[in-house]
């Protein structure tokens, strides 16, 4: 027989198949020119000394081969003795050490076989109804097409699936998608209408992350407030490895996840940007307000579900450095001034309300005054801070009000509202003797004593009725009690309390009379 | 010793909130996370959140979310965990548990928490 | 959430045979953030194993964990008397979800 003829004799091999594992597969033939065809075909095991022959058998029953040796393609023309105008099953015999292995047959008229491409360049991927939709233009002159897709995860084996006819210069294919496991999709094509052509090769590996993205474990914490009025915000993370199929290994488009770092400062809400999102590697400075944190997790198909994070504000208190002055038109606060061209936030809420919304005011840009200090004003007819009781304020600052991780605290402190002097008057003051020249004066705490820090001091003041002469006792914000000595006995006394504040002088109680009795020895 | 010490069992009706806490020793308090787990009558283990003792900062799981508020108080080494809006489902032993290197490797002795009307 | 199922429910053994406890995930358990506790009744979890497969301080030598990705074992290679109690396996990979509980009882 002549090599690029088909011969039709016994082959010079023994007919048996022996069943194994190895062996031809994944036979294909088609059409390559107007008067030339191909078959290929793949060859699983060792290929030492192995011998492949293309087997035919025409619709009369007549067969042939082709004798390829070790290669497993083969070329020849519409002369080589193969029907090509008519049904033809073609299958491989490879011989090897004495055994002949057969591929499974295909069954097809070689001139309507067409060598169809894969879906070639750019597959789309998105997700639609809970499924994944794949998209691809349709290779050129190939309209009208049976496409087939197999898919693995990690720990499964392919999976075949079936895309339907495509009829288009587009081609689509609705695919399963797995909730938390990445896969592996390749595409397949073949002439539609001619069952028992060729498919073509699988495409290139299309690989699709999970719907959800892994949510990474993550530590947050926070450095102290620093000078500055910022804080670092650092981060400790568990590393997180998404599982790949084989074919996604290595730098595969597609099943990446990025995290971000949702940032959203819950202090100062009337601010112009409550939220920002950054790039987890940046880790930012916060002001001292309270945030809540998140990170979020996202891949092609969006944000997985996030875990957020709540970072309470910094409730360190400076000494004073607020200036607070009540006049006739209203009322000013005063505080040492940052930079030029700096927006001020000044939050205040009523202690012991802290679940509630703060009252919050944003200054245009200012500049320091001539002294230094920033300044914030407002009528009394805005009732701001009126009631008589304590208030706890946060000033912030920021020169970029716009961008969150630019704000910074100036100042968070305390402070009475309303009539401090006449609300901070105690009561209930008693004088009780505590020996033959002194006595012991208690009073109910000062409401003032309620608001961390300002309470400066209690005065206790103490007025001889007779010769009219007046003794004042400075005592610590925190007793509420004091003994006064050398007394005389039989003499009237008036005793009057007040609290201060470090701006304020307090207004005295109500004068309480006592005297001590004169001991009258026997 | 290294310990977590829980307060003692609470009895509350429908509705109402409970605080529970627990004492740490025998370690640097804010070095460590912790935890609150519980554990309903005869069933298994819940994470409820955490809290980072040295900024106050917290996460909870979803399903406690806006009820649940984890504090902590450093003068004392204390760490508290409010549950409010109590259900009787809510009826569990409540767990404080230190974090190690993300897994829990030192557990109080639990909060016996009644709800019932 | 990932969840956890733990196999069997119940496991009657006698002192000096072998206990092996399953730990099934619903999805792959990454770099294998999984610890085992064992609980006495009345009494708070004790941490026997952390990362699949190290024992934590004090935990003897009979006690310990494998496995990878969804699959993990605990194998107890003696029972003494003290280790009859309820074994749960927990990941710490993606928040924190335990087992239902493997209870070892005596038989």
């Known amino acids: 027989c002549r090599t690029s003829e088909c011969c039709f004799q016994d082959p010079p091999y023994s007919d048996a198949d022996s069943g194994s594992a190895s062996g031809p597969r994944d036979l294909s033939c088609y059409r390559i020119s107007s008067a030339g065809y191909e078959c290929s075909w793949q060859y699983e095991g060792p290929t030492a000394g192995v011998s492949h022959f293309l087997r035919c058998c025409l619709s009369s029953g007549r067969c042939c081969y082709f004798a390829t040796g070790s290669a497993t393609r083969l070329q020849f023309s519409d002369q080589a003795g193969v029907s090509v105008l008519h049904t033809v099953t073609l299958w491989v015999e490879s011989w090897a050490r004495n055994r002949t292995e057969k591929s499974p047959e295909v069954t097809l008229q070689l001139y309507k076989s067409v060598k169809y491409k894969p879906p070639l360049g750019d597959i789309k991927v998105s997700k639609l109804a809970g499924q994944l939709r794949m998209e691809w233009e349709t290779p050129d002159n190939q309209v009208g097409a049976e496409v087939q897709f197999r898919h693995r995860t990690p720990s499964s084996s392919w999976k075949l699936g079936d895309c339907g006819p495509q009829d288009d210069d587009t081609e689509s294919c609705l695919c399963p998608l797995e909730m938390n496991v990445a896969q592996e999709f390749q595409l397949r094509r073949r002439r539609l209408g001619s069952q028992g052509s060729s498919w073509s090769k699988w495409s290139s590996p299309v690989c699709v992350p999970p719907e959800n993205p892994p949510q990474p474990q993550v530590r947050f914490s926070v450095e102290q407030l620093g000078r500055d009025g910022r804080r670092r915000l650092t981060l400790k993370e568990q590393p997180t490895q998404l599982e790949l199929p084989e074919g996604c290994q290595g730098p595969a488009p597609g099943v990446e996840v990025t995290y971000q770092l949702q940032l959203h400062m819950l202090s100062c809400p009337c601010k112009a940007k409550a939220t920002r999102t950054l790039p987890l590697e940046k880790m930012p400075y916060l002001s001292g307000a309270a945030y809540n944190v998140a990170v979020i997790s996202s891949n092609r198909f969006g944000p997985g579900p996030n875990q957020t994070w709540h970072i309470p504000a910094d409730t360190h208190t400076e000494p004073v450095a607020l200036n607070i002055s009540v006049g006739t038109n209203g009322t000013t606060m005063y505080w040492p001034a940052r930079a030029q061209s700096t927006t001020y936030c000044i939050e205040w809420q009523p202690v012991g309300q802290e679940g509630s919304l703060a009252t919050c005011n944003l200054t245009a840009p200012q500049d320091p005054d001539p002294a230094g200090m920033a300044t914030y004003s407002w009528s009394r007819e805005s009732g701001a801070m009126g009631q008589e009781k304590c208030y706890h304020i946060t000033i912030f600052a920021s020169a970029h009000p716009k961008k969150l991780t630019l704000w910074s605290t100036v100042l968070s402190t305390y402070h009475f509202g309303g009539n401090a002097s006449a609300a901070g008057t105690p009561h209930h003051v008693s004088v009780k003797n505590h020996s033959l020249d002194s006595v012991s004066v208690d009073w109910a705490p000062s409401l003032l004593s309620t608001c961390p820090g300002v309470l400066k001091e209690y005065v206790v003041r103490c007025r001889d009725e007779d010769s009219n002469q007046v003794s004042e006792h400075p005592v610590q914000p925190t007793e509420t009690q004091v003994t006064l000595s050398d007394l005389r006995a039989g003499v009237a006394y008036t005793v009057q309390v007040r609290a201060d504040t470090a701006w304020l002088r307090g207004a005295w109680s109500q004068p309480q009379r006592f005297s001590i009795k004169v001991q009258v020895s026997d | 010793q290294v310990q977590l010490v829980q307060s003692g069992a609470e009895v509350k009706k429908p509705g109402a909130s409970v605080k529970v806490s627990c004492k740490t020793s025998?370690?640097?308090?804010?070095?460590?996370?912790i935890h609150w787990v519980r554990q309903a009558p005869g069933q298994g283990l819940e994470w409820m959140g955490i809290?980072?003792?040295?900024?106050?900062?917290?996460s909870y799981a979803q399903q406690f979310q806006g009820r649940v508020t984890m504090t902590r108080d450093t003068s004392t080494s204390t760490v508290y965990m409010e549950l409010s809006s109590l259900r009787s489902e809510d009826t569990a032993v409540y767990y404080c548990?230190?974090?190690?290197?993300?897994?829990?490797?030192?557990w109080g002795r639990g909060t016996l928490v009644t709800v019932s009307s | 959430e990932i969840v956890l199922t733990q196999s069997p429910g119940t496991l009657s053994l006698s002192p000096g045979e072998r206990a092996t406890l399953s730990c099934r995930a619903s999805?792959?358990?990454?770099?294998?953030?999984l610890a085992w506790y064992q609980q006495k009744p009345g009494q708070a979890p004790r941490l026997l194993i952390y990362?699949?497969?190290s024992r934590a301080t004090g935990i003897p030598d009979r006690f310990s964990g494998s496995g990878s990705g969804t699959d993990f074992t605990l194998t107890i290679s003696r029972l003494e008397p003290e280790d009859f109690a309820v074994y749960y396996c927990?990941?710490?990979?993606?928040?924190?979800?335990f087992g239902q509980g493997t209870k070892l009882e005596i038989k």
């Open positions: 990362g699949a497969s």
């Open positions: 548990a230190r974090e190690g290197d993300w897994y829990f490797d030192l």
């Open positions: 927990q990941q710490y990979g993606s928040s924190y979800t």
């Open positions: 809290i980072n003792p040295s900024g106050g900062i917290t």
């Open positions: 025998g370690y640097t308090f804010t070095s460590y996370y």
């Open positions: 999805q792959s358990v990454s770099s294998s953030y």
